[in-house]
């Protein structure tokens, strides 16, 4: 188990226990209970109070990070007396040994890389392990392929994201023969960590007066539909003076992605490239390959 649990309790204890795998806090049921509540307080004095489970002798915390250390508290009243018990959940191990600079990104719609750095005070034999649990906590994913630096795990590559949901809990545990290693945990939204591919199937068709650009929305890990996308088109006249402004056009996603613009013959050589983003986050993809149209003698 990743941390010491210390109980602060009066003589007759509720025997409060916490399972970090399921994020479930439980205690001994008391006869004739009239009131019970559980909550945690973090290092910034923020309080999180989840709903009690049906049996009223446990509660499950949904979206919490524990690496800064928290204190759980249970209050129970019975028809005879009141009980209160605190459970300290520190992040035991030497300060500064936990993995740091942790980040993940999803790319190519179904791949994910997570990276981290070794803690500044971590010993040379430190080894880190990544575990991921989805918001439904139905299954735990262990890192299948570690990225290593001098034998130490400093990243993870996943090529199967089927176990993820929209919000996921990431835990990096550490081990060493020398000292205790602190853990690091984080909650990440897949929406916020996905890097889109550029739009595909970009085509340009011109008639005597106009050019029509068409493209397909990128394949994404998240289930997105056409209104969730924003596009930017860079229509660029070739062989212009350096410093000439490119024409950047913003286009909202549509069922049929297209942009029609006036361009009469004879037309000079142009290029067009497109990038995509989530309309709410505007985390732009890289640009698509430039498509050329028009002629050198236009």
């Amino acid at each position: 188990e990743k941390s010491d649990l210390r109980t602060v309790a009066p003589a007759s204890s509720l025997n409060v226990r916490f399972d970090s795998r399921t994020m479930n806090l439980s205690w001994d049921c008391q006869e004739n209970t009239t009131f019970s509540k559980c909550f945690l307080t973090d290092k910034k004095n923020r309080v999180v109070e989840p709903r009690l489970s049906n049996n009223e002798c446990s509660c499950t915390f949904r979206e919490i990070c524990l690496h800064e250390g928290v204190t759980f508290e249970v209050h129970v009243n019975t028809s005879q007396r009141g009980f209160q018990q605190k459970l300290l959940y520190p992040n035991s191990g030497r300060e500064g040994t936990a993995a740091q600079n942790f980040s993940c990104f999803i790319y190519n719609a179904d791949l994910m890389n997570c990276t981290w750095a070794r803690g500044p005070t971590a010993p040379r034999d430190v080894q880190y392990f990544l575990y991921i649990r989805n918001s439904k906590r139905r299954r735990e994913i262990r890192c299948p392929y570690y990225i290593q630096d001098s034998g130490t795990h400093v990243g993870c590559h996943l090529d199967n994201l089927s176990g993820l949901t929209s919000r996921n809990y990431f835990l990096v545990n550490g081990t060493s023969r020398e000292i205790g290693i602190q853990f690091f945990d984080s909650l990440l939204d897949t929406k916020k960590i996905e890097r889109f591919n550029p739009p595909s199937n970009v085509t340009v068709r011109c008639n005597t007066t106009h050019c029509l650009v068409r493209w397909k929305q990128p394949r994404t890990y998240q289930k997105l539909s056409y209104l969730d996308f924003q596009y930017q088109l860079d229509v660029h006249r070739k062989n212009t003076q350096p410093g000439t402004e490119n024409l950047l056009i913003n286009v909202s996603g549509d069922l049929e992605n297209r942009y029609n613009f006036p361009s009469s013959e004879p037309r000079a050589k142009h290029s067009v490239k497109i990038r995509a983003a989530d309309v709410r986050i505007l985390n732009w993809s890289s640009w698509s390959e430039a498509i050329e149209f028009g002629s050198d003698d236009g």
Epitope: T165, S166, K191, Q222, K223, L224, S225, Y226, L227, D228, L255, V279, R280
Partner: antibody
Framework: QVQLVQSGAEVKKPEASVKVSCKIP????????IHWVRQTPTKGFEWMGG????????VYAQRFQGRVTMTEDTSIDTAYLTLSSLRSDDTAVYYC?????????????WGKGTMVTVSS | QAVLTQPSSVSGVPGQRVTISCTGS?????????VSWYQQLPGTAPKLLIY???KRPSGVPDRFSASKSGTSASLAITGLQADDEADYYC???????????FGGGTKVTVL
């Protein structure tokens, strides 16, 4: 211009079933998600169900659970709504709609609607 | 009874600005879930006007704008025109009902 083509009006007796179709010409149903919504003068719009990406399956509104089935035939790009054990208060215009956004569900394009009348 | 509450009607003269309110609760608009707005002309299917609280699909004129605050949202139509005469509906998601919810609709009359 993309259009959703719905089947024609139906008149049904109480306790019967009705099946409404919704075709998307020129578009692959496998790349789109369809939801069904009905409209009555008294209750207004009522969401009936549709594809939920988080569950990766079709989900139904609680009040229609057990009476409604939504199916798709991707080979002909057609979605179907079947409502059974019809009652007079199921008389409504039934719309299929393409999901334009999933967060939360937004209906980007609606079919013209299918009038279903339940009368003895 | 609609989950989201809208005024049953509003009216204005051509060129005027009218607003329509949509009030929800902590399980829908205040959760917070985004709001969409639809226009339904007499005898036709609804048409999407606004999504993600304030974004317009291509082809919707910028006379239509919307905003959201807390558990309420509003749609504004500036430079009111005769062909804006229609029913307008707000829509969001409700976590307690696990599905889409709609307002009862507002009839806009151009005097």
């Amino acid at each position: 211009q993309v259009q959703l083509v719905q089947s024609g009006a139906e008149v049904k007796k109480p306790e019967a079933s009705v099946k409404v179709s919704c075709k998307i010409p020129g578009h692959s149903l496998s790349e789109l998600s369809i939801h069904w919504v009905r409209q009555t003068p008294t209750k207004g719009f009522e969401w009936m169900g549709g594809f939920d990406p988080e569950e990766n399956e079709i989900v139904y509104a609680q009040r229609f659970q057990g009476r409604v089935t939504m199916t798709e035939d991707t080979s002909i790009d057609t979605a179907y709504l079947t409502l059974s054990s019809l009652r007079s208060d199921d008389t409504a215009v039934y719309y299929c709609a393409i999901v334009g956004s999933f967060s939360p569900i937004t209906y980007g394009l609606w079919g013209k609607g299918t009038m279903v009348t339940v009368s003895s | 009874q609609a989950v989201l509450t809208q005024p049953s009607s509003v009216s204005g003269v051509p060129g005027q600005r009218v607003t329509i309110s949509c009030t929800g609760s902590g399980s829908n608009i205040g959760a917070p879930y985004d709001v969409s707005w639809y226009q339904q002309l007499p005898g036709t299917a609804p048409k999407l006007l606004i999504y993600h609280n304030n974004k317009r699909p291509s082809g919707v004129p910028d006379r239509f704008s919307a905003s959201k605050s807390g558990t309420s949202a509003s749609l504004a139509i500036t430079g009111l025109q005769a062909d804006d005469e229609a029913d307008y509906y707000c829509q969001s998601y409700d976590s307690s009902l696990s599905g889409s919810v709609f307002g009862g609709g507002t009839k806009v009359t151009v005097l």
